[in-house]
Interface confidence: low
C-alpha cells in the first residue's frame, strides 16, 4: 500500500509488509477459530498456483515498539498492535477435509490507547 | 479482528469492516496498477462460489474523521487514512483475459502524522 513517508508523513506505528507463502505459513486460524493447514498449491485449469499472502504487521525492531508515535503522553498510554483480516485460502482441517475457508492473516499495525489514570 | 474496545482500549482511528461481494465491487486495481473486473463467481465442481472480500476502512462518520484520537496536537497534524493490502481474486483484464490476480482491497485505517511547522 502507498507509503506515507513519500508524502512527508510519518505513521503512528511502524509496520513491515512481506509476501508469505503457504509453506512458510503452514497453519492459520479460520473464522470458526479452528486451526487449519494452509495448502501450498491451488489446482487451476492449467496446473497449480502457489498459494501466498501479503501480510503486514507491527515492526518489532521499529521506533514504535515501545509505544505509538505522536501520542499525547500526558493523557494516554499507547501500544502498536498488529490487526488481522480475513482472506480466502485453500486449507485442510483437523479431519483432513480440504476446502476454501476464510483465514485470518496479519494486515496492519494500528495504535490502541488507554487513558492514563491518577495523574 | 479482535476489538480493542473489549479490552478497555480505544483506537487512534475509527474503522468499519464489512463483507463486500464482487457484485458490489465490480472493479479493482491489480498489482500493476491496471483496472480489472472482479468476477462475481468462481467456478466450482457443483456450480459456483460467490467471490467476496473482508474490507476495513476509515469510518467517515466516526469521531476521528477530523483527525486521529490521542495525538499530541502541539507538535503534530494527524489524519486517519485507509490503507490497502493485496488479495488474490478471479478477475478479467481490459483484454478480456480471465485469471487469478492480486488486487488491492481496503484492509485498515491507520493514523498518519505531519510535523507542525512554525509554532
Amino acid at each position: 500500500h502507498s507509503d506515507p513517508a513519500r508524502r512527508g508523513e510519518l505513521s503512528v506505528c511502524d509496520s513491515i509488509s512481506e509476501w508469505v507463502t503457504a509453506a512458510d505459513k503452514k497453519t492459520a486460524v479460520d473464522m470458526s477459530g479452528g486451526t487449519v493447514t494452509v495448502l501450498e498449491k491451488v489446482p487451476v485449469s492449467k496446473g497449480q498456483l502457489k498459494q501466498y499472502f501479503y501480510e503486514t504487521k507491527c515492526n518489532p525492531m521499529g521506533y514504535t515498539k515501545e509505544g505509538c508515535r505522536g501520542i499525547d503522553k500526558r493523557h494516554w498510554n499507547s501500544q502498536c498492535r498488529t490487526t488481522q483480516s480475513y482472506v480466502r485460502a485453500l486449507t485442510m482441517d483437523s479431519k483432513k477435509r480440504i476446502g476454501w475457508r476464510f483465514i485470518r492473516i496479519d494486515t496492519s499495525c494500528v495504535c490502541t490507547l488507554t487513558i492514563k489514570r491518577g495523574r | 479482528h479482535s476489538d480493542p474496545a473489549r479490552r478497555g482500549e480505544l483506537s487512534v482511528c475509527d474503522s468499519i469492516s464489512e463483507w463486500v461481494t464482487a457484485a458490489d465491487k465490480k472493479t479493482a486495481v491489480d498489482m500493476s496498477g491496471g483496472t480489472v473486473t472482479v468476477l462475481e463467481k468462481v467456478p466450482v465442481s457443483k456450480g459456483q462460489l460467490k467471490q467476496y472480500f473482508y474490507e476495513t476502512k476509515c469510518n467517515p462518520m466516526g469521531y476521528t474523521k477530523e483527525g486521529c484520537r490521542g495525538i499530541d496536537k502541539r507538535h503534530w497534524n494527524s489524519q486517519c487514512r485507509t490503507t490497502q493490502s493485496y488479495v488474490r481474486a478471479l478477475t478479467m483484464d481490459s483484454k478480456k483475459r480471465i485469471g487469478w490476480r492480486f488486487i488491492r482491497i481496503d484492509t485498515s485505517c491507520v493514523c498518519t502524522l505531519t510535523i507542525k511547522r512554525g509554532r
Epitope: L39, V42, P43, D93, K96, G99, W100 | S45, K46
Partner: antibody, heavy 122, light 109 residues
Framework: EVQLLESGGGLVQSGGSLRLSCAAS????????MTWVRQAPGKGLEWVST???????YYADSVMGRFTISRDNSKNTLYLQMNGLRAEDTAVYYC????????????????WGQGTTVTVSS | KIVLTQSPGTLSLSPGERATLSCRAS???????LAWYQQKPGQAPRLLIY???RRATGIPARFSGSGSGTDFTLTISSLEPEDFAVYYC??????????FGGGTKVEIK
C-alpha cells in the same frame, strides 16, 4: 462425461481378501475426493470410506483396520483393499465422486459407478 | 454420529400426485449440508438435491428440497411414472462418518 467403473468384486471366504478398483474418466481425477459406499442386499446405503485430494483417508467404524482406501492419480483409479472379510461385508460396493478442492469441504456424492458385488461366504 | 430418520418408510401414491418425504437429523446439520438421492432397482443412486435445496445438473424442476437445522423435506410436485423409486437423504455436515437415512420407498398406489 463422468464415468466410474468398479471391478474386483466376487465370492470370497470369510476371513479372505479382495481388492476393488474404480476406473475414473471424464473429469480431473486428481482434484476430486473419492468415496466408497456399500449396500447390503435389500438394505440401505452405508458409507464405507473416503480419500481426499491430499490422500487423507476416512473410514466407517465397521471397516476401520480391515479396509484400506487408496488412489493412483497417474492411472485415474481408486482402490479399496478389503482384508478380514466378514459375512456382513456382503454388499454391492459403489465408488462415487465427493467434490473438488474448489468446494467448501462439505460435499455430497455427485457421480456414482454402477457397483461391483462382493459376497462373503461363511 | 448424526443419525438421519426418514419418514414415511413407504409412500403409496398415484402418478400426478404430490409426494412429500421427510428427513430428520438427530442434531442440527446447519442450513444446507443435506443431499437427496434417488435409487431405482438394480441401479446406482443418483444425486437429486444438494445443499438442502439446490437441484443437481439435469434434475427436473418437479423435484425440490427445503428445510434447515434438523428437519428437511424433499417434494416431488407431480409424480411421473419414472419417479417411483427409493429416496435417501444424506448429511455431510459433520463427518466422518457420512450418514444416510434409511430410505423412503415411493410406490405406485
Amino acid at each position: 462425461e463422468v464415468q466410474l467403473l468398479e471391478s474386483g468384486g466376487g465370492l470370497v471366504q470369510s476371513g479372505g481378501s479382495l481388492r476393488l478398483s474404480c476406473a475414473a474418466s471424464g473429469f480431473i481425477f486428481d482434484d476430486y475426493a473419492m468415496t466408497w459406499v456399500r449396500q447390503a442386499p435389500g438394505k440401505g446405503l452405508e458409507w464405507v470410506s473416503t480419500i481426499n485430494q491430499n490422500s487423507g483417508t476416512y473410514y466407517a467404524d465397521s471397516v476401520m483396520g480391515r479396509f484400506t482406501i487408496s488412489r493412483d492419480n497417474s492411472k485415474n483409479t481408486l482402490y479399496l483393499q478389503m482384508n478380514g472379510l466378514r459375512a456382513e461385508d456382503t454388499a454391492v460396493y459403489y465408488c462415487a465422486t465427493t467434490g473438488t478442492t474448489y468446494d467448501y469441504p462439505h460435499y455430497p456424492m455427485d457421480f456414482w459407478g454402477q457397483g461391483t458385488t462382493v459376497t462373503v461366504s461363511s | 454420529k448424526i443419525v438421519l430418520t426418514q419418514s414415511p418408510g413407504t409412500l403409496s401414491l398415484s402418478p400426478g400426485e404430490r409426494a412429500t418425504l421427510s428427513c430428520r437429523a438427530s442434531q442440527s446439520i446447519g442450513s444446507r449440508y443435506l443431499a437427496w438421492y434417488q435409487q431405482k432397482p438394480g441401479q446406482a443412486p443418483r444425486l437429486l438435491i444438494y445443499d438442502a435445496s439446490r437441484r443437481a445438473t439435469g434434475i427436473p424442476a418437479r423435484f425440490s428440497g427445503s428445510g434447515s437445522g434438523t428437519d428437511f423435506t424433499l417434494t416431488i410436485s407431480s409424480l411421473e411414472p419414472e419417479d417411483f423409486a427409493v429416496y435417501y437423504c444424506q448429511q455431510y455436515y459433520d463427518w466422518p462418518p457420512l450418514t444416510f437415512g434409511g430410505g423412503t420407498k415411493v410406490e405406485i398406489k
